[in-house]
Interface confidence: medium
């Protein structure tokens, strides 16, 4: 069974068949005898009922309201009402774009990545048992494919397959011709599959400073667009006036991956800010990376092996 | 209305500068993240630069590393390019674009830009 209309508010394409199906259905099933009615107001007119009298392009079925087809004037708000349940819908009918074979503000994106799967599948379960005949067209040209009633493409997708895919239902209804335009804007893009963000250059530093003077830590790291690089240090950060983050900056690769870097600037060295760790983290969905920075007076030089120290 | 205004493009010989301001209006200005986009003819929209909401963290692409910087005020609602050394090959129509994450980074995907600026013309002779 066809799901139900609980968008409130719905844009369609003058001169195809629509519908609106409230959702109450089951129950409306439950009490035959309840009165059901549909309103429509636009405008100056407010609540006007409507039945199939009211317009020959009009039908009602149990928890439906058809149009065959819907046209300009249709835009409107709708009303369904039963007993105390009503539901309300606004309706916005645009006009079809004649130099085309659909109407670009009736497009649905799709991002796909290249060499993934991609499926397109032609499909209208509400109008099924109606449809002669389905069509997918690219970019407006008709495909060839085997299956003319639910036309599919199932493939990995290339940048060649980038286009505007349009499944087009051609049904009849009472002697008359109607098609219905659903269209795909795909888009193919690299692959974004993500990598593990690494920081740059060895875990842990000693860095010779002299009290007084300034230093600046610099962390580097090579990440995803996603992944956040911060320091932390000493009980709280934001304790130590003298301690300033500075901007971070990134570099976009040609892989469309960052290279980060955020500096720690410590100014007018004291005491406190020796021997203790400065940690940098780059985060991401994959688990954290973390390397630690020490400062050490220079004096004191001698009784560190000189490979764990950064100038 | 959202609106985004681009300004300050114009001809310059090589090795010149410029410095392209974007004026926000209609929006929450300091709630989206912000991003400078150029495109040369025939050739796809490009991300340049960007900023988050805050301004804590600026994004460049490789090619104008060192030479662009980017900045924002949020309480005049500005953005700035500032291009320095401009080559022939920094020749194209930049855009001005805000970014819908108010937490979290600028993006260098378009697609992920909700406003966008009318673009302002930089030309660079050699």
């Known amino acids: 069974a066809e799901s139900c209309t609980s968008r409130p508010h719905i844009t369609v394409v003058e001169g195809e068949p629509f519908y609106l199906k409230h959702c109450s259905c089951s129950l409306a099933h439950e009490i035959e005898t309840t009165t059901k009615s549909w309103y429509k107001s636009s405008g100056s007119q407010e609540h006007v009922e409507l039945n199939p009298r009211s317009s020959s392009r009009i039908a009602l079925h149990d928890c439906v309201l058809e149009f065959w087809p819907v046209e300009l004037n249709d835009t409107g708000s709708y009303f369904f009402q039963m007993k105390n349940y009503t539901q309300k819908w606004k309706l916005n009918v645009i006009r079809r774009n004649k130099h085309s074979c659909f109407t670009e503000r009736q497009v649905t994106s799709k991002i796909v990545e290249v060499k993934k799967f991609f499926q397109i599948t032609c499909e209208n379960s509400y109008y099924q048992t109606l449809v002669n005949s389905t069509s997918l067209y690219k970019n407006c040209k008709k495909l060839l494919l085997e299956n003319n009633k639910n036309p599919t493409i199932k493939k990995n997708a290339e940048f060649e397959d980038q286009g505007y895919y349009s499944c087009v239902h051609f049904l009849h209804h009472n002697g008359k011709l109607f098609n219905i335009t659903k269209t795909f804007n795909i888009t193919i893009v690299e692959d974004r599959s993500n990598i593990v963000p690494v920081l740059l250059g060895p875990k842990l530093n000693h860095v010779a400073v002299e009290l007084g003077k300034n230093v600046r830590l610099n962390c580097s790291a090579l990440l995803n667009e996603e992944d956040v690089i911060y320091w932390m240090f000493g009980e709280e950060n934001g304790s130590d006036p003298n301690i300033h983050e500075e901007k971070e900056m990134r570099i976009m690769t040609p892989e469309g991956k960052w290279h980060a870097s955020k500096v720690l600037r410590i100014e007018n060295i004291g005491e406190s800010n020796l021997n203790v760790l400065y940690n940098c983290t780059v985060a991401s969905t994959g688990g954290t990376d973390t390397k630690s920075f020490i400062l050490v007076r220079k004096a004191d030089m001698a009784d560190i092996p000189g490979h764990v120290f950064t100038r | 209305d959202v609106q985004l205004q681009e300004s300050g493009g114009g001809l310059v010989q090589a090795g010149g500068s410029l410095r392209l301001s974007c004026a926000a209006s209609?929006?929450?200005?300091?709630?989206?993240?912000m991003g400078w986009f150029r495109q040369a003819p025939g050739k796809d929209r490009e991300f340049v630069a960007g900023?988050?909401?805050?301004?804590?963290?600026?994004y460049y692409r490789d090619s104008v590393k060192g030479r662009f910087t980017i900045s924002r005020d949020n309480a005049k609602n500005t953005v700035w390019l500032q291009m320095n050394d401009l080559k022939p090959e920094d020749t194209a129509v930049y855009y001005c674009?805000?970014?819908?994450?108010?937490?979290?980074?600028?993006?260098?995907?378009?697609?992920?830009?909700?406003?966008w600026g009318q673009g302002t013309q930089v030309t660079v002779s050699s």
């Open positions: 674009a805000a970014a819908r994450r108010r937490v979290g980074l600028p993006l260098a995907d378009p697609r992920e830009y909700v406003y």
């Open positions: 209609g929006l929450p200005f300091s709630s989206y993240a």
């Open positions: 900023i988050t909401w805050s301004g804590s963290s600026i």
